[in-house]
Interface confidence: medium
């Protein structure tokens, strides 16, 4: 089952080389796997990583570095992702999503 999760920050503009933080507000009782996607114009959405709330661990997609995206926060209420060392190619719409089973 798919759940829609509310992102608190709707739009951010940052300089290259800086960082940005995105917050994902979780539905009450959200458990399981919380996924982060990047959707860029003209491309299919790309999953960057997912958070396994059962083991409190993060699984990265291939080619994604632990230093680039940092996910943390309370999985019961919200989950935050920091994007570091921003480049122009990081521009796009970031989504979080969860599947309950």
């Amino acid at each position: 089952k798919s759940s829609n999760l509310e992102g608190r920050t709707k739009s951010v503009i940052r300089q290259t080389g800086s960082s940005a933080e995105i917050t994902c507000d979780l539905a009450e009782g959200s458990t399981g796997y919380i996924h982060w996607y990047l959707h860029q114009e003209g491309k299919a959405p790309q999953r960057l990583l997912y958070y396994d709330s059962y083991t409190s661990s993060v699984v990265l997609e291939s080619g994604i570095s632990p230093g680039k995206y940092d996910t943390y926060g309370s999985t019961r209420k919200n989950l935050r992702m920091i994007l570091r060392n921003l480049i122009e190619n990081d521009s796009g719409v970031y989504y979080c999503a969860t599947w309950d089973g």
Epitope: S56, S57, G63, S65, P66, G67, Y72, R84, N85
Partner: antibody, heavy 120, light 107 residues
Amino acid sequence: EVQLVESGGGLVQPGGPLRLSCAASGFTFSSYAMNWVRQAPGKGLEWVSAISGSGGSTYYADSVKGRFTISRDNSKNTLYLQMNSLRAEDTAVYYCAKADYGVVYYFDYWGQGTMVTVSS
Amino acid sequence: DIQMTQSPSSLSASVGDRVTITCRASQSISTYLNWYQQKPGKAPKLLIYAASSLQSGVPSRFSGSGSGTDFTLTISSPQPEDFATYYCQQSYSTPYTFGQGTKVEIK
């Protein structure tokens, strides 16, 4: 000058625990992911675990998942590896390594290593 | 997991010879490939990252090339301090895996 100094190694019986530490200096510790890499005697290098700058994201090799826990204290500029249920095959020199990333992720600074021996 | 295979496992060379070490990945890793040098009893040292970028402070006689699955580390004219073991490592996906190493010995 970047420095990484590991400690906590030693002789431990199979099934026992051990905690390794890595004291970091010379860079903004909380801004960088950190890793543990090990090397069994006479063997090659094996990546063990990584942790993001905030400590919120952790990653493990399958061989240690569920037994080892990586953590960090950014206020003390220290990286840790809690090792439980140790096995003979965990015997190795354990290195902490600072990670950097640009186009790719790489280990640009390493500590001198600390030896862990698991034996009865 | 991505397997990294280095060849040869060892080689003998003279000072000034050209040394080439190859590394093959079990699947395409783009340029997510790093090279390290290790001397006996010492920690590894980063030489090359992103397949061909020379780490700061590393002599220009070291160079790297390749993309996809096949990569090469070249020492154009080895000096006595270059005789060591060299490892490739992929950082395309976790677990980050290393090649088994290539020991470069003095002939």
